[in-house]
């Protein structure tokens, strides 16, 4: 995805000294935390696959790109990156695959330049509603985040809290309207069964939305109308059966949109007629000639673009008196 990358050619590994436990203590100019690699030229710090259990306290103030991937952080507390002086340059933070199961309110506070955040591949059983907004005010200070990567953050079923995972994630996205400037949101591979209806309306700046490899069956209650800047919508590898007229019209009305619909088990019956008509006319669907019917059996493997209304029938529903057991 959009992980922060580095052109760092020379990294200085830290000398094995004791990291200061006092985050308020100003770091030395060229200091590099134990178990990390640093490149001041590339403004990059990499603490990768080191089984760290907490965020290093002595991060250099110059850091712009911070990789903390492949660790064992477990919990990200409030102010996990708050330092004196603050990490004012930190723009890209990658925490993927670090066994985080809890991100607390205000975890990313005091990072005024943070534009890219990747929390992918962490089993987030407890994501605070105020993880990104920092406060429980009804309207928070705007977050600087432009890209938020949350792919595969669903915990195993036995570790989930007794609540909707979709609801928990959406609460964090919407709290305090802090993410109004978000342009890229990736939520792939999270077993989402539905998309709460209010989520997209409150993220008006979105350019790229990735919902691929979830279990979305329908978009009936999802509105794309406000997303006038949306450029790519990834819906591949879901459980979509058909897109209805309202959704089709909204997508067609978005001026820059490209939609990706591969690998959905389309049901080619009478309810598919509008979508087929739309597909034949629209230019917004990428690889539209790859879309094929999965059901019913007599229609299996047929290319949607080659269907006509005569092909699309529904078996009549028999009145109860005529039904056989």
């Amino acid at each position: 995805s959009s992980s922060p990358t580095s052109s760092a050619s020379s990294f200085s590994s830290s000398a094995p000294f004791l990291a200061s436990a006092v985050s308020a203590q100003p770091p030395l100019p060229d200091q590099c935390p134990a178990l990390c690699e640093c490149s001041e030229a590339a403004r990059t710090v990499k603490c990768v696959n080191r089984n760290l259990t907490e965020v290093p306290t002595d991060l250099p103030a110059y850091v712009r790109n911070l990789f903390l991937t492949g660790n064992q952080l477990a919990v990200l507390p409030a102010g996990a990156f708050a330092r004196r002086p603050p990490l004012a340059e930190l723009a890209a933070l990658n925490l993927s695959g670090s066994r985080l199961d809890e991100v607390r309110a205000g975890a990313f506070e005091h990072l005024p330049s943070l534009r890219q955040l990747d929390l992918s591949h962490n089993p987030l059983a407890d994501l605070s509603p105020f993880a990104f907004s920092g406060s429980n005010a009804s309207v928070s200070a705007p977050s600087p985040l432009v890209e938020l990567i949350l792919n595969h953050i669903v915990p195993p079923e036995d570790e989930r809290q007794n609540r909707s995972f979709e609801g928990m994630v959406v609460a964090a996205l919407l709290a305090g309207r802090a993410l109004q400037g978000l342009r890229r949101l990736e939520l792939a591979s999270n077993h989402f069964l539905y998309l709460p209806r209010d989520v997209l309306a409150q993220l008006p700046s979105l350019r790229h939305l990735d919902l691929s490899n979830n279990s979305l069956v329908s978009l009936t209650y999802v509105s794309f109308r406000n997303l006038t800047h949306l450029e790519s919508l990834h819906l591949e590898d879901n459980a979509l059966k058909v897109l209805h007229n309202g959704t089709l019209a909204e997508l067609q009305g978005l001026p820059h949109i490209r939609v990706f619909l591969d690998n959905n088990p389309w049901v080619c019956d009478c309810h598919m007629a509008d979508m087929v008509t739309w597909l034949k006319e629209t230019e917004v669907v990428q690889g539209k000639d790859r879309l094929t019917c999965a059901y019913p059996e007599k229609m299996r493997n047929r290319v949607l673009l080659e269907l006509n209304s005569a092909d699309l029938d529904c078996d009549p529903i028999l009145p109860p008196s005529l039904q056989t057991s």
Partner: antibody, heavy 116, light 107 residues
Framework: QVQLQQPGTELVKPGASVKLSCKAS????????MHWVKQRPEQGLEWIGN????????NYNEKFKNKATLTVDKSSSTAYMQLSSLTFEDSAVYYC?????????WGQGTTLTVSS | QVVLTQSPAIMSASPGEKVTMTCSAS?????MHWYQQRSGTSPKRWIY???KLTSGVPARFSGSGSGTSYSLTISSMEAEDAATYYC??????????FGGGTKLEIR
């Protein structure tokens, strides 16, 4: 009953090219993608690529991009696969198969022998 | 790209015996298909969408699984079941991937 007819055998020399055919009948040819699959003796199945007969769009397995070229003739409901610069490793059975999610009908296969 | 690994590569069973073969995916997939190929013939789609039998396939065959682990089971082996069985990834976009096959012989 859907049928995909393929010639039984082709014998060609190394370095030459060959064009294998697959004639479809008893279904609407343009409504389904056509796939090609390779099987070497005593080996497994290897997907080569597919073609949409309606518009000629193709997809290829990276491994076969410089080896296979897929085309169709809609008027005769026939799919073709040209294999170029043949080597002994290209000796195999080549199947055409109708498909989308899966391959629901297969041809009988053409046994290609590359021999000097 | 998802890799499919079938096991065992070769197995034998006596008539009437229960047979189970597996197909393991390198990452989670939604469904799996199975093909039967008898010696000297082309493959036939046998089971699709993990558990649905193609028309004409005997009811002694069944398929199951989810995520990365799938299996094909024959409740009572018959001589005509001797064949090679291939699993294939559920997808409608390239590439289409097959497992290496399980060769089932009659004992």
């Amino acid at each position: 009953q859907v049928q995909l007819q393929q010639p039984g055998t082709e014998l060609v020399k190394p370095g030459a090219s060959v064009k294998l055919s697959c004639k479809a009948s008893d279904y609407t040819f343009t409504s389904y993608w056509m796939h090609w699959v390779k099987q070497r003796p005593e080996q497994g199945l290897e997907w080569i690529g597919n073609i949409n007969p309606s518009n000629g769009n193709t997809n290829y397995n990276e491994k076969f991009k410089n080896k296979a070229t897929l085309t169709v003739d809609k008027s005769s409901s026939t799919a073709y696969m040209q294999l170029s610069s043949l080597t002994f490793e290209d000796s195999a059975v080549y199947y055409c198969a109708r498909g989308g999610w899966d391959f629901d009908y297969w041809g009988q296969g053409t046994t290609l022998t590359v021999s000097s | 790209q998802v890799v499919l690994t079938q096991s065992p590569a070769i197995m034998s069973a006596s008539p009437g015996e229960k047979v189970t073969m597996t197909c393991s995916a390198s990452s989670s997939v939604r469904y799996m298909h199975w093909y039967q190929q008898r010696s000297g013939t082309s493959p036939k789609r046998w089971i699709y969408d993990t558990s649905k039998l193609t028309s004409g396939v005997p009811a002694r065959f069944s398929g199951s699984g989810s995520g990365t682990s799938y299996s094909l089971t024959i409740s009572s082996m018959e001589a005509e079941d001797a064949a090679t069985y291939y699993c294939q990834l559920w997808t409608s976009k390239p590439p289409w991937t097959f497992g290496g096959g399980t060769k089932l012989e009659i004992r």
